[in-house]
Interface confidence: medium
């Protein structure tokens, strides 16, 4: 069964149960429910999942049984709407239950919360975790799925199954190791960091589909897959793009069973046709399903064919350019993007999309002109400044990163972005700037040819986090403008923002700069976040403060924390020295 051929099934739920198997079926339904009802207790979700699973089994036994012919949205929506505390817990989301499908599902989707009010996940002691794992492995792993899914309502569900498999493997191995902590903690840290990155990448895919439409996502996929599979024919890349779009549309739309099923079909297709796709797939295709799909998604770019001719011949010099464009605009532009991307693994996907947009705009104008060829003859010259802009930006920022190191580079970005958009909440500015700053350690180590795709495509993911968080509570017209005008120009839009001269500085509040002894017991990362929170607040109070002034205050602050954490009476030190620090800072900044 291909991704595109949907055989007629009497019962969709029975079909998916049989395709996916009971274990994956239950896991995916749990993820789906947790992503919709993010505040519900674990036990409630497990109960709902068990009820759905038992129902699915009756449909497997007899596809004609009552209600087995209902759509998955109807079945799942009906089940979610049985939750007794829906109105108290979710407020207006309960109104979704008064709607019919497909409006009801759309309503649930609109109420997904990217920043749910949930407590931070605290990691228990290793022995406590190992005991819980051994006592009830199934519940332990379900709890993992539940906790990740409710905090990341757009997490790519089939990929979360892969994370859960690795999570289980880590506990299986490490809970019987001599030094459990040394074995387990680095693995859990790695899963946590990879999980956050995976969630953010998927959030951009869903935003692309939901805010900018299928055409935008397909363009992104053509560019990325053409870079990855430069030996594949255009028709092959187009097939993969169409299938991949279907998979992500399903997952972003909450159709997790269909998404996981279709992703498995796509992996199967790719592996059966690897000779016409890429020489790099062999190892991936020998792995079990979840690992295989993950591996394919991360596979390195194949080598470019050696004999690729100049692009100008087909897309500038040919007398058929306007004819080909007129006959099938999207196909011709798709071919242009394919041909350009397969020749440029050194460009970011967003840059390739900017070039394709420029080419499209030029053809729109020139193919209506008196002399089309004369009009579009220099179109490739228009690409030069578009290519140089990210190249120069990356060069400058990598130099700054190498000079400052990650923490101070993050601080420089915190100041830069707080001055650009000071209305944005402090936690969001800290989170986003810290992530922007990670581009340095992630990408600056790469050679020139890999820097731009690494850096600019990563920045697109991070800026999307800012966009989705800001959309929940919009406070800045400038953020809204950069986020909504053009998906591919978000980063240049934010880069071009200068200091917001209209901003009225925040009133000074000493409480914001009052610290206590508990800071001493925090991890290095948490301590950094405290200091960076203070830095953002300083800039919001004094947006015109110079780098030097801010550096002096932050150096004093670091010395103050270090001194008081070494003191015998820490709390008294923080109280007395803190007052002095606030006064000195106010004086230094002229507050």
């Amino acid at each position: 069964r291909g991704v595109f051929r949907r055989d007629a099934h009497k019962s969709e739920v029975a079909h998916r149960f049989k395709d996916l198997g009971e274990e994956n079926f239950k896991a995916l339904v749990l993820i789906a429910f947790a992503q919709y009802l993010q505040q519900c207790p674990f036990e409630d979700h497990v109960k709902l999942v068990n009820e759905v699973t038992e129902f699915a089994k009756t449909c497997v036994a007899d596809e004609s049984a009552e209600n087995c012919d209902k759509s998955l949205h109807t079945l799942f929506g009906d089940k979610l709407c049985t939750v007794a505390t829906l109105r108290e817990t979710y407020g207006e989301m309960a109104d979704c239950c008064a709607k019919q499908e497909p409006e009801r599902n759309e309503c649930f989707l609109q109420h997904k919360d990217d920043n749910p009010n949930l407590p931070r996940l605290v990691r228990p002691e290793v022995d406590v975790m190992c005991t819980a794992f051994h006592d009830n492995e199934e519940t332990f792993l379900k709890k993992y799925l539940y906790e990740i899914a409710r905090r990341h309502p757009y997490f790519y569900a089939p990929e979360l199954l892969f994370f859960a498999k690795r999570y289980k493997a880590a506990f299986t191995e490490c809970c019987q190791a001599a030094d459990k902590a040394a074995c387990l903690l680095p693995k859990l840290d790695e899963l946590r960091d990879e999980g956050k990155a995976s969630s953010a990448k998927q959030r951009l895919k869903c935003a692309s589909l939901q805010k900018f439409g299928e055409r935008a996502f397909k363009a992104w996929a053509v560019a990325r897959l053409s870079q990855r599979f430069p030996k594949a024919e255009f028709a092959e890349v187009s097939k993969l793009v169409t299938d991949l779009t279907k998979v992500h549309t399903e997952c972003c739309h909450g159709d997790l069973l269909e998404c996981a099923d279709d992703r498995a079909d796509l992996a199967k297709y790719i592996c059966e046709n690897q000779d016409s796709i890429s020489s790099k797939l062999k190892e991936c295709c020998e792995k079990p399903l979840l690992e295989k799909s993950h591996c394919i998604a991360e596979v390195e770019n194949d080598e470019m064919p050696a004999d690729l001719p100049s692009l100008a011949a087909d897309f500038v010099e040919s007398k058929d350019v306007c004819k080909n464009y007129a006959e099938a605009k999207d196909v011709f532009l798709g071919m242009f993007l394919y041909e350009y991307a397969r020749r440029h693994p050194d460009y970011s996907v967003v840059l390739l999309l900017r070039l394709a947009k420029t080419y499209e705009t030029t053809l729109e104008k020139c193919c209506a002109a008196a002399d089309p060829h004369e009009c579009y003859a220099k179109v490739f010259d228009e690409f030069k400044p578009l290519v140089e802009e990210p190249q120069n930006l990356i060069k400058q920022n990598c130099e700054l990163f190498e000079q400052l190191g990650e923490y101070k580079f993050q601080n420089a970005l915190l100041v830069r972005y707080t001055k650009k958009v000071p209305q944005v909440s402090t936690p969001t500015l800290v989170e986003v700037s810290r992530n922007l700053g990670k581009v340095g350690s992630k990408c600056c180590k790469h050679p020139e040819a890999k820097r731009m795709p690494c850096a600019e495509d990563y920045l697109s993911v991070v800026l999307n986090q800012l966009c989705v968080l800001h959309e929940k509570t919009p406070v800045s017209d400038r953020v809204t403008k950069c986020c909504t005008e053009s998906l591919v120009n978000r980063r240049p839009c934010f880069s071009a923002l200068e200091v917001d001269e209209t901003y009225v500085p925040k009133e000074f509040n000493a409480e914001t700069f009052t610290f206590h002894a508990d800071i001493c017991t925090l991890s290095e990362k948490e301590r950094q976040i405290k200091k960076q929170t203070a830095l953002v607040e300083l800039v919001k109070h004094k947006p015109k403060a110079t780098k030097e002034q801010l550096k002096a205050v932050m150096d004093d602050f670091a010395a103050f924390v270090e001194k008081c954490c070494k003191a015998d009476d820490k709390e008294t030190c923080f109280a007395e020295e803190g007052k002095k620090l606030v006064a000195a800072s106010q004086a230094a900044l002229g507050l």
């Epitope: 291909g2 991704v3 595109f4 051929r5 024919e233 255009f234 028709a235 092959e236 187009s238 097939k239 169409t242 297709y269 016409s276 087909d314 058929d320 080909n324 006959e327 099938a328 196909v331 011709f332 071919m335 041909e339």
Partner: nanobody, 119 residues
């Protein structure tokens, strides 16, 4: 040797339908993307539709979108073009061809079948 043999053309009234077939041999049909092109009297070749080796996705020229449907039967090594709501401007010789990796052109094409739309 690659051979492509089109059939199914003929005279039809505006608004009518025709189904073209193309029998392929001499190459591995089920690993080749295929397309239909056409040439109206006194005009150049015009691209009509492409189909991937697996049967999906399919692509259409803007001028035929919603009226023409391309399909294939890999077990019979045959390509099809279902043409509905035909218009006078669809009059042309229709060719099936192998779709290559580059350009909106092709490696091989058949002898063609003439479709005339006239009242």
């Amino acid at each position: 040797e690659v051979q492509l043999l089109e059939s199914g053309g003929g005279l039809v009234q505006p608004g009518g339908s025709l189904r073209l077939s193309c029998a392929a041999s001499g190459f591995t049909f089920d690993t080749s993307s295929m397309l239909w092109v056409r040439q109206a009297p006194g005009k150049g070749l015009e691209w009509v539709s492409v189909i991937h080796q697996s049967g999906t996705p399919t692509y259409y020229a803007d001028s035929v979108k919603g009226r023409f449907t391309i399909s294939r039967d890999n077990s019979k090594n045959t390509l099809y073009l279902q043409m509905n709501s035909l218009r006078a401007e669809d009059t042309a010789v229709y060719y099936c061809a192998k779709f290559p990796s580059r350009k909106m052109k092709f490696d091989y094409r058949g002898q063609g079948t003439l479709v005339t739309v006239s009242s």
